[in-house]
């Protein structure tokens, strides 16, 4: 069985990549980052 810890890790593994893509979009569109 997949542990709760592993599920949380898998869920969180792309958070920085999402922030990265959002920030790149923010630099173009000047959408507020808050």
């Amino acid at each position: 069985a997949v542990s709760e810890h592993q599920l949380l890790h898998d869920k969180g593994k792309s958070i920085q990549d999402l922030r990265r893509r959002f920030f790149l979009h923010h630099l173009i569109a000047e959408i507020h980052t808050a």
Epitope: G12, Q16, R20, F23, L27, E30, T33
Partner: antibody
Framework: QVQLVESGGGVVQPGRSLRLSCAAS????????MSWVRQAPGKGLEWVAT????????YYPDSVKGRFTISRDNSKNTLYLQMNSLRAEDTAVYYC???????????WGQGTLVTVSS | QLVLTQSSSASFSLGASAKLTCTLS???????IEWYQQQPLKPPKYVMD???????STGDGIPDRFSGSSSGAERYLTISSLQSEDEADYIC?????????????FGGGTKLTVLG
């Protein structure tokens, strides 16, 4: 094709100021965030500043915050870096770089050398 | 803090494959990074971004001899069929936004020498 040409480098005394320029062509300048990255002689790369497409948002590392100001004039397709209170450790080649939707520093200029020395 | 570690140099023979490593600080092992190439006396050139799952997107004009992969906190740049023009510094970089502040750090770079 994307072209970025830096200018304004030279020799300057510690404590003095200098303004670098980066002339952009081959793309819609006002549509992209722009950055400055520097490289001290024989050393690695260091991010210096980033500005959003319209100039509303600016970002700096602690090493230059309060001394350097990034700005842009979209009507002139030009990026600037105003450098005040210069120190010997600011001696470097300064590159301007353009983002894409996919990455921060996709296109680079040839660089301009700034030497801070008495 | 966010740190990238690279070996300072590596040597491989002409026509061989080179695998260069960039290691993220352990608490940042899931981060997407970028690879850059800097040939002697030239500005850096964007090579690719490389995600935690090994997927990557290459920059303009980068030959398909260049590929990326990942394992844990390590990010790899593999160059197959090495050519003399591949001799360069290869630098990794990573950015993040923390409390509406942007940070971007570079690794120290690996100087790749192509022998023969």
């Amino acid at each position: 094709q994307v072209q970025l040409v830096e200018s304004g480098g030279g020799v300057v005394q510690p404590g003095r100021s200098l303004r670098l320029s980066c002339a952009a062509s081959g793309f819609t300048f006002s549509s992209y965030g722009m950055s400055w990255v520097r490289q001290a002689p024989g050393k690695g790369l260091e991010w210096v500043a980033t500005i959003s497409s319209g100039g509303s948002y600016t970002y700096y590392p602690d090493s230059v915050k309060g001394r350097f100001t990034i700005s842009r004039d979209n009507s002139k397709n030009t990026l600037y870096l105003q450098m005040n209170s210069l120190r010997a450790e600011d001696t470097a080649v300064y590159y301007c770089a353009r983002q894409t939707t996919m990455t921060y520093f996709a296109y680079w200029g040839q660089g301009t050398l700034v030497t801070v020395s008495s | 803090q966010l740190v990238l570690t690279q070996s300072s140099s590596a040597s491989f023979s002409l026509g061989a494959s080179a695998k260069l490593t960039c290691t993220l600080s352990s608490q940042h092992s899931t981060y997407t990074i970028e690879w850059y190439q800097q040939q002697p006396l030239k500005p850096p050139k964007y090579v690719m971004d490389l995600k935690q799952d090994g997927s990557h997107s290459t920059g303009d004009g980068i030959p398909d001899r260049f590929s990326g992969s990942s394992s844990g906190a390590e990010r790899y740049l593999t160059i197959s069929s090495l050519q003399s023009e591949d001799e360069a510094d290869y630098i990794c970089g990573v950015g993040d936004t923390i409390k509406e502040q942007f940070v971007y750090v570079f690794g120290g770079g690996t100087k790749l020498t192509v022998l023969g």
